[in-house]
Interface confidence: low
């Protein structure tokens, strides 16, 4: 009789990324018999939960269940029913919840407790909800991109599977920008990692990696903006803040109570003689850049070299994948092309920020004004962070690759997190098997 292929033997996993500004659910799929192979896990679905990040539900925890419903129902549809009970579900909360925990451990626990109870109601194998550390966030992001780029594979390919792939096995560094924190993770070249908190050792597929990582809490794009506003309103000592990071003609009223809600602005807090102030955009890239630089304390460094705020940073090495908000913002600004030099990016930002708000609104009519208004700040912040914060130069800029997806999977920490928790990255190189991709009977 003719050989017949067995029914597809696949597995699924679900990871929820509970970020500071929103939650996303990712569904991953892989062939069951090739769990230990590199590069076999891929993303089949992303579902963005409608609404803010889970930390915003602190006063309305009863709404969390409804909040998660749509995406969890979507997971029910995508994953075959026969697989539901063996599909692990993980929720990792990042810097938004780290900040809430800093304010009140009790409130953070309350939110996570309700999240766990809500997720336990689904027919999947719920594995828990937790606040991951900044170090984990950096490490898992690094694992994700290098796994997807095939950097852990010992087999030499005769074809390139990804646009960024160089033929060597040197890993990519990972640059992750969220709303509340930003991570930098890479393998330094023969450099001692002077600060133990920033050192990670991995053994993956038979190879040792000494990895540097740091997560800068409060330096995600949203919290950086709050910091900048809190810093600048001190100087204003009045109800108008003429802000170079917003387009000329843009106006927005900000409540002082909202400004001081986050622990990130505590260092700038002062008693202001008003309850509200108005941002008035003046759209000047250079001034915006200068204002942002004041958020980085570069005057103190107890190591051979630092990023900012006294945090050790080894000399940059190799190529870097910049993802999450690094990618979304640069993609919107049309600046992700490898051909665009740093000087060109700066030039484009100058022009963009100087465009009148009315003109911007007309040009990008489909974009929500809240997001649209902040691209000038976010783009300038990205440049400031990469150049002055992490010490990229005009020359090393070409080693930054703004990455949204690799092989159809989003760049970010979630895949690395799942690979780790499902033990799908072996320490040793698996023995190669003579079996081809299909098993016949």
């Amino acid at each position: 009789t003719q050989n017949k292929a067995l029914p597809e033997n696949v597995k699924y996993g679900i990871v929820l990324d509970a970020g500071s500004s929103h939650t996303s659910l990712y569904i991953y799929k892989w062939p069951a018999e090739k769990e230990n192979d590199t590069g076999v896990v891929h993303q089949v679905e992303e579902c963005r939960v409608k609404g803010p990040g889970i930390s915003k539900f602190v006063q309305k925890v009863n709404e969390i269940g409804i909040y998660l419903t749509d995406c969890m129902e979507r997971a029910r549809e995508v994953i075959p029913r026969s697989q539901h009970q063996e599909t692990p579900v993980y929720l990792g909360a990042t810097a938004g919840m780290r900040l809430l925990r800093m304010e009140s451990e009790e409130l953070a626990d309350r939110v996570l407790d309700v999240v766990e109870r809500s997720l336990s109601n689904y027919p999947f194998d719920f594995q828990g909800a937790r606040i991951i550390t900044g170090q984990e966030e950096g490490a898992y992001g690094w694992i994700t991109i290098n796994y997807l780029l095939g950097k852990f594979s010992q087999k030499t390919r005769w074809f390139s599977i990804v646009p960024y792939e160089t033929n060597n096995q040197e890993t990519f560094g990972a640059l992750d920008l969220g709303g509340a924190s930003t991570q930098v993770t890479f393998v330094p070249q023969n450099q001692t990692i002077e600060s133990p908190d920033n050192a990670l050792q991995f053994r993956l597929y038979g190879k040792d990696y000494n990895v540097y990582t740091h997560s800068f809490l409060c330096y995600g794009k949203d919290q950086a903006l709050w910091q900048k506003l809190a810093k600048d309103i001190q100087v204003a000592s009045n109800e108008i803040l003429r802000d170079p990071c917003f387009h000329p003609g843009y106006k927005k009223v900000v409540n002082v109570s909202d400004l001081y809600k986050t622990p990130c602005t505590k260092r700038f807090e002062m008693t202001l003689p008003f309850q509200q102030f108005e941002i008035q955009g003046i759209g000047n890239y250079q001034q915006c850049h200068q204002s942002i630089l004041e958020l980085f304390n570069t005057s103190y460094c107890p190591y051979s070299q630092c990023a900012f705020n006294g945090i050790f940073l080894p000399p940059l090495q190799g190529d870097f994948g910049a993802f999450s908000a690094f990618y979304f913002v640069m993609k919107f600004l049309n600046l992700t092309s490898e051909k665009v030099s740093q000087e060109k990016v700066t030039e484009m930002m100058k022009k963009f920020c100087a465009q009148p708000w009315e003109e911007i609104k007309t040009s990008y009519a489909g974009v929500k004004e809240k997001y649209l208004s902040e691209y000038c700040f976010s783009g300038t912040y990205i440049l400031s962070l990469l150049l002055q914060g992490y010490h990229f130069t005009a020359d090393s800029w070409e080693h930054i690759h703004f990455i949204g997806k690799i092989q159809g999977s989003d760049a970010g920490w979630t895949l690395g997190y799942m690979l780790n928790l499902t033990n799908m990255i072996p320490a040793e190189q698996p023995l190669s098997t003579p079996l081809s991709h299909s098993t016949y009977v």
């Epitope: 810093k231 204003a236 000592s237 009045n238 108008i240 008693t271 108005e278």
Partner: antibody, heavy 119, light 109 residues
Framework: EVQLVQSGAEVKKPGATVKISCKVS????????MHWVQQAPGKGLEWMGR????????KYAEKFKNRVTITADTSTNTVYMELSSLRSEDTAVYYC????????????WGQGVMVTVSS | DIVLTQSPALAVSPGQRATITCRTQ??????????MNWYQQKPGQPPKLLIY???SLASGVPARFSGSGSGTDFTLTINPVEADDTANYYC????????FGGGTKVEIK
């Protein structure tokens, strides 16, 4: 060039009300906070209050709180200061002045208006 | 209100250094920015800004004028003094609305 031109000198009786104007040329008053400062003869400068003409929000010094009203007319680019229940110690020169965000050096003053309160 | 106290009067010979002090009841610093300004006023004229943010020289002001200090203690220095510097000098804080010091009368001997 920004210029602040104030209205003419006034002589008022005790208990009366005076209203002084300050017309700004060269820039919109909405770009500034407009302050009023009192200077009695031979005395120092005393801040009275200010207005944010863009929102018509005002702040007053405790000493003048119940008697002073600062208003703005953005159509004529003019700011007004009204002082009521005048008494002899209100005899002074009254200046209007601009303030942008401190740290930006944009500081303009009117020439001053002499108000004499006498029975 | 933030109260500002100035030395009341000063007599200086031309070519000498004049030092005017201003003490604030509470700090006018905030995270590295110092909201202290200095004005010169001559009879019959409005005040003229000399120094802003404690030490920045306003445009058109001669370099003979300088400002220093932080927190609660501030100094305006005129060096060398010229005959034309006879005037009243006021410190002013703009950290929280405005308040002026009582003024220092500088006479050239």
């Amino acid at each position: 060039e920004v210029q602040l031109v104030q209205s003419g000198a006034e002589v008022k009786k005790p208990g009366a009300t005076v209203k002084i104007s300050c017309k700004v040329s060269g820039d919109s008053i909405t770009a500034y906070f407009m302050h009023w400062v009192q200077q009695a003869p031979g005395k120092g400068l005393e801040w009275m209050g200010r207005i944010d003409p863009d929102h018509e929000r005002t702040k007053y010094a405790e000493k003048f709180k119940n008697r002073v009203t600062i208003t703005a007319d953005t159509s004529t680019n003019t700011v007004y200061m009204e002082l009521s229940s005048l008494r002899s110690e209100d005899t002074a020169v009254y200046y209007c002045a601009t303030e942008r965000v401190p740290g930006f050096e944009t500081d303009y003053w009117g020439q001053g208006v002499m108000v004499t309160v006498s029975s | 209100d933030i109260v500002l106290t100035q030395s009341p009067a000063l007599a200086v010979s031309p070519g000498q250094r004049a030092t005017i002090t201003c003490r604030t009841q509470q700090t006018v610093d905030h995270y590295g920015t110092t909201y202290m300004n200095w004005y010169q006023q001559k009879p019959g004229q409005p005040p003229k800004l000399l120094i802003y943010l404690a030490s920045s020289l306003a445009s058109g002001v001669p370099a003979r004028f300088s400002g220093s200090g932080s927190g609660t203690d501030f100094t305006l220095t005129i060096n060398p003094v010229e005959a034309d510097d006879t005037a009243n000098y006021y410190c002013q804080q703009s950290r929280n609305l405005w308040t002026f010091g009582g003024g220092t009368k500088v006479e050239i001997k």
